[in-house]
């Protein structure tokens, strides 16, 4: 059961797991959440009747029943994880906590203008969990706009005690807003020789991977496969760091892979998911129940559905045993790993689901697409959103995608002549036009946030955001799609996409059905050369033949450009402008979403 | 066939700076770990810098960290070299070429002659 | 850091010899170790890595073996394409050092 609410004056009895220092109930509730085990939590505020050294101490607590006796207790605030809870889950803190010294290893001091430059910092800086400033009116004059950049082993402050005149805050990394470079590159037959902050068991080098991007200390890691020579040491995943935030060396051994912590584009990729399943691979841990499933995938339901589990093994049934159930072992550890993998006793296993809501919904998988033809089907491009305006009579007007579950993103030069967002219509999960009848639901828009910078699309700042009047369900037929990392500008996205319902030729009409053209990216220089009087910038993209043939058109503005990588679609750019549609040597020209990605976070996550 | 070209060298004097260039093709040049070797006039290989594919992490040799700086641009399929405060020991050949998963230098290029000499 | 060392320096042979060139590492690299083959005013060319394994393309007269510190190059049956300066690279950890050449030209 989801249960949101805070208790005010109440402690949970018993079932301590570990005691953290947190700056709000709030955000020991998102502390419990993202701890494998913790399903309750009682925070101590600050209060006369406490005893300071217990004030701000969040107990995280566990227990069979999921449930602890309540205890009355002036200043404790306890309430449940949101493990329990079916919602979207993000660890962004944008906090700042005035008269709060938030404790750790001060590793890094230097002068800053104000908070949010030493939070900046902070977000920049590799090793940087929170951060304390002292505010030009601290007492003592030679600590006057000083940026603390702290960090501690579990990523959460050590102490927090209060202290005048400063302001403290967390890194705002896990909010997509880090300009750290995303270091995605997987090094086989390579060990990196640093410090070990932690070891963990895990499947594969991508589990190890994954562990190491949510963990707070771990800058990179080492994975020794199931062929490792060292029985010992097989499918063992070594969690490091290091002072540069670098492998100072990289050795070769044979059986082994090593990687970077994905932190900086954690928004744009699974990294509490572990979707796998591991044939003839038993997980070991502390068994939490068995129950007979017919299959592997029901056994994983069944882990889902246990709040407790985290993972599970499921051994087949023998010939015609049991109804033709096989056995279901659910299981958890104390870090959420298993605490031994074996290999050769036939066994299938993988991880709860869970936690796959603590990712952005947009790292989902999607079915796949349709090789061929250019029509769409109904849920290829489920982020896609025809936007209709009403007046003088309702007609589509522009193409956009869901980037959150209010909140659509499309191109500027759309709301020419759009007095109101009244007259505005988004339908999603939407294949053909024919499909929108006067009793069709759609999403009405609350409010059109056009960039300040934007005069005409052809120069640039084409993008618009719009806020929905109520929230989107997720379904399979409308989603969102992962805004690119800023860590990633230097990926080559290879799989692009236009889609759309505008003209397929210049002299034309808008199209019943969803059309879709895979079309390469250009760079920059090569599209200048093609477009001489008109300047492209860097905050635009480029794609297109140089034959022409395929191109957005009339129609598809506002809508994607849309980029496979790693398996995750990110939304390149926005079809903004172009000379003609699919003329030779005229590649259409985007909105370069990447350079975009701190307006748009700014504007959606804005309090 | 994998080609990669340098570019960029010539005569600079003590305490210059340089920036050589590798353009490659014939591979797929985002997936592949790059690096730069150099060899001075009748002399051995040294392996000067490597950079990931990504270009999110840099290796140097003792010899040349905090001057030379390695990058590479995935879109225009090319690796750079900038070399600053030269010395009349950075006078080589300067090959570009690709790094394997064998840790082997599998292709190179035909190199760019640097000369610092006053 | 890792040194390596090349033996001879440098070596006669006539074409259909057979020669033997030896490279030692400063400690043991396991069998991490390239083997490159440079003609005069050309790019070297990889020949072998993992001290036995012949890159795509190398004829089967070159091999390689050793492991830990001592390896060694053999080139059968020599021929006239053949004379140019090898150099063997370790491969065990960076930063990346190649031995110092060994010249090979015809008696």
């Known amino acids: 059961e989801c249960v949101t609410q805070l208790l005010k004056d109440t402690c949970f009895e018993g079932g301590d797991i570990t005691t953290v220092f947190t700056p709000s109930a709030k955000y020991c509730q998102v502390v419990c959440t993202y701890h494998p085990r913790c399903l309750l939590f009682t925070f101590t505020a600050e209060s006369p009747s406490e005893d300071p050294t217990r004030w701000f101490t969040c107990v995280l607590k566990d227990s069979v029943t999921e449930t602890l006796p309540r205890v009355n207790r002036t200043a404790a605030i306890s309430g449940y994880s949101f493990k329990q809870c079916s919602h979207q889950i993000s660890a962004c803190n944008k906090d700042i906590y005035v008269d709060l010294d938030m404790k750790g290893i001060n590793y890094n001091s230097s002068v800053a203008k104000s908070a949010q430059e030493c939070q900046e910092r902070c977000t920049d800086d590799v090793h940087c969990h929170f951060f304390t400033y002292a505010t030009r009116q601290f007492p003592s004059l030679e600590h006057r706009n000083i940026c603390l950049l702290k960090h501690t082993q579990t990523g959460t402050p050590t102490r927090i005690t209060k202290l005048d005149k400063v302001v403290s805050g967390f890194s705002l990394k896990s909010c997509a807003l880090s300009n750290l470079a995303c270091i995605r590159d997987i090094f086989p037959n390579t060990v990196f020789a640093d410090s070990n902050i932690d070891s963990v068991m895990a499947p594969d080098a991508f589990v190890c991977g994954r562990i190491c991007t949510h963990h707070p200390g771990c800058l990179f890691f080492t994975f020794f496969s199931q062929e490792w020579p060292k029985e010992s040491q097989r499918n063992l995943c070594l969690l490091k760091t290091s002072e540069s935030g670098l492998p100072s060396t990289r050795i070769k051994k044979s059986k082994a892979l090593s990687g970077f912590s994905l932190q900086s584009c954690r928004h744009s990729i699974p990294v509490f998911c572990h979707s796998s399943f591991y044939h003839d691979t038993d997980f070991l841990g502390e068994e939490l129940d068995i129950v007979a499933a017919k299959s592997h995938e029901a056994c994983q339901k069944l882990c889902t559905n246990a709040v407790r589990c985290q993972f599970f093994t499921y051994t087949p049934a023998q010939a015609s045993c049991n109804e033709g159930k096989g056995k279901c072992y659910l299981k958890l550890s104390s870090n959420g790993s298993p605490t031994k993998i074996l290999h050769g006793r036939g066994g299938i296993s993988g991880y709860t689901l869970r936690l796959c809501k603590m990712d952005n919904e947009c790292t989902t998988k999607i079915k796949p697409r349709i090789v061929g033809g250019t029509a769409s089907v109904r849920g290829e491009w489920p982020w896609q959103v025809t936007l209709h305006t009403t007046s003088p009579t309702q007609r589509h007007l522009c193409g956009g995608s869901i980037i959150g579950n209010q909140w659509i993103l499309t191109a500027a030069h759309c709301f020419y002549g759009v007095e109101s967002p009244k007259i505005l219509r988004v339908y999603s999960g939407i294949l053909n036009q024919s499909e929108i009848k006067e009793d069709t639901s759609f999403f009405g828009v609350q409010e059109i946030i056009i960039h300040d910078q934007y005069k005409m699309a052809e120069s640039g700042y084409d993008i618009a955001l719009l806020k929905l009047e109520t929230t989107v369900n997720y379904t399979d037929s409308q989603r969102p799609i992962c805004l690119p990392s800023k860590g990633d500008r230097n990926v080559i996205y290879t799989d692009c996409w236009v889609t759309g319902w505008g003209y397929r030729k210049l002299r034309d009409k808008i199209q019943n059905t969803l059309q879709k053209a895979k079309i390469p990216l250009v760079t920059n220089e090569e599209c200048q050369k093609r477009y001489r009087g008109h300047k492209i910038t860097h905050k635009m993209i480029c794609a297109g033949y140089r034959e022409g043939g395929k191109d957005a058109c009339k129609g598809d503005s506002g809508g994607p450009l849309s980029c496979k990588h790693n398996e995750v679609w990110h939304l390149v750019g926005i079809t903004s402008w172009g000379e003609g549609c699919a003329q030779r040597e005229r590649p259409g020209v985007y909105t370069n979403v990447v350079e975009y990605v701190d307006w748009i976070l700014e504007k959606t996550q804005a309090v | 066939e994998v080609q990669l070209l340098e570019s960029g060298g010539g005569l600079v004097q003590p305490g210059g700076s340089l920036r050589l260039s590798c353009a490659a093709s014939?591979?797929?040049?985002?997936?592949?770990?790059m690096a730069w070797v150099r060899q001075a006039p009748g002399k051995g290989l040294e392996w000067v810098s490597s950079?990931?594919?990504?270009?999110?992490?840099?290796l140097y040799a003792d010899s040349v960290k905090g001057r030379f700086t390695i990058s590479r641009d995935n879109s225009k399929n090319t690796l750079y070299l900038q070399m600053n405060s030269l010395r009349a020991e950075d006078t080589a050949v300067y090959y570009c070429a690709t790094w394997g998963d064998s840790w082997g230098f599998d292709f190179w290029g035909q190199g760019t002659l640097v000369t610092v000499s006053s | 850091d890792i040194q390596m060392t090349q033996s001879p320096s440098s070596v006669s042979a006539s074409v259909g010899d057979r020669v033997t060139i030896t490279c030692r590492a400063s400690q043991g690299i396991s069998s991490w170790l390239a083997w490159y083959q440079q003609r005069p005013g050309k790019a070297p060319k990889l020949l072998i890595y993992d001290a036995s394994t012949l890159q795509s393309g190398v004829p089967s007269r070159f091999s390689g073996s050793g492991s830990g510190t001592d390896f060694t190059l053999t080139i059968n049956s020599l021929q006239p394409e053949n004379f140019a300066t090898y150099y063997c690279q370790q491969a065990d950890s960076f930063p990346i050092a190649f031995g110092q050449g060994t010249r090979l030209e015809i008696k």
């Open positions: 950079i990931v594919p990504s270009g999110g992490w840099t």
């Open positions: 014939g591979f797929t040049f985002s997936d592949y770990e």
